[in-house]
Amino acid sequence: HKSSSQGQDRHMIRMRQLIDIVDQLKNYVNDLVPEFLPAPEDVETNCEWSAFSCFQKAQLKSANTGNNERIINVSIKKLKRKPPSTNAGRRQKHRLTCPSCDSYEKKPPKEFLERFKSLLQKMIHQHLSSRTHGSEDS
């Protein structure tokens, strides 16, 4: 069970890191291209990973102004890195009934980042709940 628990920890750490990166980007929201991006909200159960991939695919861009361009670009790149896979994630990938990215409401960068953070928090909570109930599925 040790490697299973280490895998769960790795997944949890990665999700938590993504929240920190989102928080970092929120400090530079005025230096992002003010483009409207698909921002899933109130994501239906079992479509979290689908919504997550919509956030990762979105074209968040630096406005290339000032000295913050490098940190913004690195942060955006890190947001797009694939997190460790989980059984729940693998199962969800096979679902064809989740909304397409284009069907989600488009929002400016500030709201986009806030919604991304909310989804990540929801996913952490679900992950913890499944651990509590003895499932190794998380």
Partner: antibody, heavy 117, light 106 residues
Framework: QVQLVQSGAEVKKPGASVKVSCKAS????????MHWVRQAPGQGLEWMGL????????IYNQKFKGRVTMTRDTSTSTVYMELSSLRSEDTAVYYC??????????WGQGTLVYVSS | DIQMTQSPSSLSASVGDRVTITCRAS??????LNWYQQKPGKAPKLLIY???RLHSGVPSRFSGSGSGTDFTLTISSLQPEDFATYYC????????FGGGTKVEIK
């Protein structure tokens, strides 16, 4: 077992810089980010920032931005925290703490930095 | 920035007492709260994470509860080794610690 061993106490003059090290062992160094936290004498804990040990990505507490630099050396599994333009208020014990799943799960023993003219 | 306020800042209690420490966040932090214990001259140690989950090796007399802005750390029956300072810490947005609560011997 996980261990974080920090460098020894430092005495510095106002305006100088200090570089504190934290050597990690007992786990895969680049799998875990690292936090730095400080504690002034008789005071509470203050979060300074964190570093991604795999690629030196950093997130700093705005309060220390411009004065703090966090780096790492993967060959020795060591992270560093450098604080510049020191003032007497920077006298504190500085801790490194491992970025666990949802908390700072392991801490170094602390490094006292004393700033005095 | 999210501010964390702990109360009381210190308390006196006897071995066997039930002790309750509270922590209030300046905004909703959901369950993103941890508790640490620190003894004089030592580094802090993680006790409870995500409001109510016991870190490995922590005795079950420690428990945490709360949600949103108000949180509680309870020691059901104080032991000699529990005399220390306790800190809450939010991790909803970056990290902030409370001012600490010192638990002293009565």
């Amino acid at each position: 077992q996980v261990q974080l061993v920090q460098s020894g106490a430092e005495v510095k003059k106002p305006g100088a810089s200090v570089k504190v090290s934290c050597k990690a062992s007992g786990y895969t160094f680049t799998d875990y980010w690292m936090h730095w936290v400080r504690q002034a004498p008789g005071q509470g804990l203050e979060w300074m920032g964190l570093i991604d040990t795999s690629d030196v990505y950093t997130i700093y507490n705005q309060k220390f931005k411009g004065r703090v630099t966090m780096t790492r050396d993967t060959s020795t599994s060591t992270v560093y925290m450098e604080l510049s333009s020191l003032r007497s208020e920077d006298t504190a014990v500085y801790y490194c703490a491992r970025y666990g799943p949802l908390a700072m799960d392991y801490w170094g023993q602390g490094t006292l930095v004393y700033v005095s003219s | 920035d999210i501010q964390m306020t702990q109360s009381p800042s210190s308390l006196s209690a006897s071995v066997g007492d039930r002790v309750t420490i509270t922590c209030r966040a300046s905004q909703d932090i959901s369950n993103y709260l941890n508790w640490y214990q620190q003894k004089p001259g030592k580094a802090p140690k993680l006790l409870i994470y995500y409001t109510s989950r016991l870190h490995s090796g922590v005795p079950s007399r420690f428990s945490g509860s709360g949600s949103g802005t108000d949180f509680t750390l309870t020691i059901s029956s104080l032991q000699p080794e529990d005399f220390a300072t306790y800190y809450c810490q939010q991790f909803h947005t970056l990290r902030t610690f409370g001012g600490g609560t010192k638990v002293e011997i009565k």
